[in-house]
């Protein structure tokens, strides 16, 4: 029988959108044709307010950080290790986790991932449709109403639940993330909210639901009181840098 895609499972992996954009949908463990999934990240931190966060592995750092000894490039070399800001494209690296979201480590250099760019063929004048509120609209079939003025389309930013193409289609505090097989505007995560931290960049299974990334000034890190828990059950939350 069909390997059912569990849509209602808390175990479903959630993924943040790529920088600038894309996102997600529902499911139970499924075997689906492999698809490109996006690696997301938080806003790059500035050095001014950067508080070193001790770590033992990349897992414990935000998605725009990696775990390393401050004076050495690689993790695992003696001494204290802290979460360091990820390396942008064309910077030197020793493993994928060192590169910023949307990049991977190739031949010692951070290179852009093929899927870090929004696919071609996207609609320029994206008309935002609100999934939650306009089913009963009088216009058409309760489907999107275009606001036209002198035959130009004026965009309203998508509210939570609106279908989107990229995060810029969504109102402030929302990002464009995958939900089932579509993409909708979802809330950017606040401090203390559960976030998704992937073990290895570029090696995710099918992500039916994506969470947004953590809000500004926050990073997705393992919750301190979960350090002793088993690897599979460690909880990541959005925490202050």
């Amino acid at each position: 029988t069909l390997n059912s895609v569990l849509i209602n499972s808390n175990a479903i992996k959630n993924l943040p959108p790529p920088l600038g954009g894309a996102g997600g949908q529902p499911g139970s463990a499924v075997s689906v044709a492999p698809g490109v999934l996006y690696e997301g990240g938080n806003k790059y931190q500035t050095l001014d307010n950067y508080q070193p966060y001790p770590c033992a592995e990349d897992e414990e750092c935000g998605s725009d950080e990696y775990c390393s000894s401050p004076s050495r490039g690689a993790a695992g070399v003696g001494g204290v290790q802290i979460c360091l800001a990820c390396r942008k494209r064309r910077k030197r690296c020793m493993r994928h986790a060192m590169c910023c979201p949307g990049n991977y480590c190739k031949n010692g250099i951070c290179m852009p991932s093929d899927h870090s760019h929004f696919p071609r063929g996207e609609i320029e004048e994206s008309i935002i449709e609100n999934l939650g509120n306009d089913h009963n609209a009088a216009a058409g079939d309760g489907y999107p109403r275009r606001t036209t003025l002198t035959s130009k389309i004026y965009h309203t930013k998508g509210q939570e639940g609106s279908v989107c193409l990229r995060s810029s289609d969504c109102a402030a505090g929302l990002c464009c993330a995958r939900h089932f097989w579509s993409k909708i505007c979802k809330p950017v995560l606040k401090e203390g909210q559960v976030c998704t931290k992937h073990k290895r960049k570029g090696s995710h299974g099918l992500e039916i639901f994506q969470r947004c990334y953590c809000g500004e000034g926050l990073a997705c890190r393992i919750q301190k009181d979960h350090h002793q828990a088993s690897n599979s059950s460690r909880l990541h939350t959005c925490q202050r840098h």
Partner: antibody, heavy 114, light 112 residues
Amino acid sequence: QVQLVESGGGVVQPGRSLRLSCAASGFTFSGYGMHWVRQAPGKGLEWVAVISYDGNDKYYADSVKGRFTISRDNAKNTLYLQMNSLRAEDTAVYYCARELRVLWGQGTLVTVSS
Amino acid sequence: DIVMTQTPLSLSVTPGQPASISCKSGQSLLHNDGKTYLYWYLQKPGQPPQFLIYEVSNRFSRVPDRFSGSGSGTDFTLKISRVEAEDVGIYYCMQSIQLPWTFGQGTQVEIK
């Protein structure tokens, strides 16, 4: 106008192929996951396949796996279903459907008969 | 697959009288996002599905207010407060929370 219009149905012999199209208009097609659902004469609906908004992820019902291929062209706002090795039991009205804000087309009839 | 079970399978109603159809799902249709992905639609002979209710209780546009949906988790009900001649057809419930989408067997509503 927000609508989905299927085409490409017809009568075909067992073992042959057919390609269905679904033209979308009036909404942001490239943001939605799209599905194909079919209904055999006098029967209930059966889900067939889904494709993600960007075309990267596809999933099929066991009954069509390996024979049918779902695809989409977001630049043309069109969804496709390539049906190979057709069988008599594939005879049905095929509907394309949008998820979340559920929207269906009028359907196109595929008859597989020798 | 999530099994959707409808009762009754047929219903004969006097015009102006109420009608009620039950739909039970094999597992909860409540998603982590707080929504319950249960739909009701009506199908008339030779026509595509005409969606009536989305997410348990929300009417689609242009659906008369005599149609209402209720329920939660695994038990759902579609009610027609006063059946009219145009309401005849087969009513189906459908879940879209898990692939494959699955459908009830249908309830045939006819006028006495």
